[in-house]
Interface confidence: low
């Protein structure tokens, strides 16, 4: 087998050889990637933007945050790409999933509710390794306990019930700006993966002691960027090759 | 069809600390939105419910009013509830109840309201 | 903390009479994001724990007779016993589980007349 004596070949040139070969294949593996998108977008050259932009453009929450300080490093460093790679050639990946519109949503007490969300097939019920939903607190003015529940809508049963629990949290607020709070759901995910069409969408409740309710689930003026969002981070492993 | 029952000592003295064990049984209570509640009742009054925990996340919250003399814990292997309340005065002798919202995923948010009650445990606080 | 205020504290009614007990909260147990009231009655004979018979205000717990029925919104509600049966002989307790802490009424005493 051409491949596997290719690999024998490195490892008995040493560590660093090997590093570099994976790190020559997997960067012209990437950039063939990046050919073929820009040919589907029928562009000669990668747009040119910068940060701000992005920062401008994206949820100002924490993980998004973290993805571009890491790829304006990246960048720097004249490194590659937004996935991760260990020993078993496992790549991860981090899909950012927004809201969007869903009719069933739109129906439920004739006002529009938060959040439906549609899903990439990448994301695939047995490849998601973490899924966080992450909603934004808006500040309170005296310190306060609030009470978060993110409840999964179901079709109406004889009863009229519409919702089924999630998950629910307990938190301390104090006075200042407000919070990302991000909850698991991965649970949630994987059935909804298994079963799209119980993907009707979640509502999101989130009440201060006074009963007011803190979650920016439809932005208001002054917060673009702050609606609720999926972050879900998938892997795929592919059997591990033997030596 | 889930039942609970709660246990602990018919009498305790003023200052102790009283602990009252409520213990699911029939069902299980592992499926997201499981809420169980302690509320007590003086003899002849009113009800007053004292704390919550959500049954497969670490949620808890007391009466704001009781909350320095309030813990309450579980242990998810032995399907129990644990309540435990310091320096016990006269005025708590009541009848305590564990009360739980059966499929309170389908009814709305929190637990809010209790169709599942253990028969309840009287305590005397007496010297 | 909302303080559930029921009146009257005893009321006689005879068999086959309607029976009204109401309910105030000091503040609103409405949650206008799911449109509900997080209000639910009980009934409690001696002896025995609280048995749930209304919650949202209005909707019925499975097995309860429709004699019973609640109504109201916001911060004022009923519970109405249609037609009064020689077992509904007990204490009516409304309780709001809309914000912590969760707070029970007094009580009303329903008797026969």
């Known amino acids: 087998n051409e491949n596997s004596e290719q690999k024998e070949n490195v490892e008995k040139e040493g560590l660093c050889n090997a590093c570099t070969w994976r790190q020559n294949t997997k960067s012209s593996r990437i950039e063939a990637i990046k050919i073929q998108i820009l040919s589907k977008l029928r562009l000669e050259t990668a747009p040119n933007i910068s940060k701000d932009v992005i920062r401008q453009l994206l949820p100002k929450a924490p993980p998004l945050r973290e993805l571009i300080d890491q790829y304006d490093v990246q960048r720097d460093d004249s490194s590659d790409g937004s996935l991760e790679d260990d020993d078993y050639h496992a790549t991860t990946e981090t899909i950012i999933t927004m809201p969007t519109e869903s009719d069933f949503l739109m129906q439920v007490d004739g006002k529009p509710k938060c959040c439906f969300f549609k899903f990439s097939s990448k994301i695939q019920y047995n490849k998601v390794v973490k899924a966080q939903l992450w909603i934004y607190l808006r500040p309170v003015e005296t310190p306060t306990t609030v009470f978060v529940q993110i409840l999964r809508l179901i079709k109406p049963m004889k009863d009229g019930t519409r919702y089924t629990g999630i998950r629910s949290l307990k938190l301390d607020m104090n006075p200042g700006t407000g919070i990302w709070q991000s909850i698991d759901v991965k649970t949630v995910l994987q059935n909804w993966l298994k079963q799209p069409e119980s993907n009707l969408g979640i509502e999101i409740k989130a009440l201060d002691e006074n009963g007011h309710d803190l979650a920016v689930t439809f932005p208001g003026p002054g917060e673009d960027g702050l609606n609720p969002f999926l972050e879900v981070k998938v892997t795929d492993t592919p059997k591990r090759s033997r030596r | 069809q889930v039942t609970l029952r709660e246990s602990g000592p018919a009498l305790v003295k003023p200052t102790q600390t009283l602990t009252l064990t409520c213990t699911v049984s029939?069902?299980?209570?592992?499926?997201?939105?499981?809420?169980v509640n302690w509320i007590r009742q003086p003899p002849g009054k009113a009800l007053e419910w004292l704390a919550m925990?959500?049954?497969?996340?670490?949620?808890?919250v007391y009466n704001s009013a009781l909350k320095s003399r309030l813990t309450i814990s579980k242990d998810t292997s032995k399907n129990q509830v644990v309540l435990t309340m310091t320096n016990m005065d006269p005025v708590d002798t009541a009848t305590y109840y564990c009360?739980?919202?059966?499929?309170?995923?389908?009814?709305?948010?929190?637990?809010?309201?209790?169709?599942?009650w253990g028969q309840g445990t009287m305590v005397t606080v007496s010297s | 903390d909302i303080v559930m205020t029921q009146s009257p504290d005893s009321l006689a009614v005879s068999l086959g009479e309607r029976a009204t007990i109401n309910c105030k909260s000091s503040?609103?147990?409405?949650?206008?994001?799911?449109?509900?009231?997080?209000l639910a009655w009980y009934q409690q004979k001696p002896g025995q724990p609280p048995k749930l018979l209304i919650y949202?205000?209005?909707s019925l717990e499975n097995g309860v007779p429709d004699r019973f029925s609640g109504s109201g919104s916001g911060t004022d509600f009923t519970l109405t016993i249609s037609s009064l049966q020689a077992e509904d002989v007990a204490v009516y307790y409304c309780?709001?589980?809309?914000?912590?802490?969760?707070?029970f009424g007094g009580g009303t005493k329903v008797e026969i007349k």
């Open positions: 009360a739980h919202r059966q499929n309170v995923d389908s009814y709305g948010y929190w637990g809010d309201a209790f169709d599942i």
């Open positions: 029939g069902g299980s209570l592992s499926s997201g939105g499981s809420y």
């Open positions: 925990t959500d049954w497969d996340a670490d949620n808890i």
């Open positions: 503040q609103s147990v409405l949650y206008s994001a799911d449109n509900k009231n997080y």
């Open positions: 949202d205000a209005s």
């Open positions: 309780q709001q589980g809309h914000l912590f802490p969760y707070s």
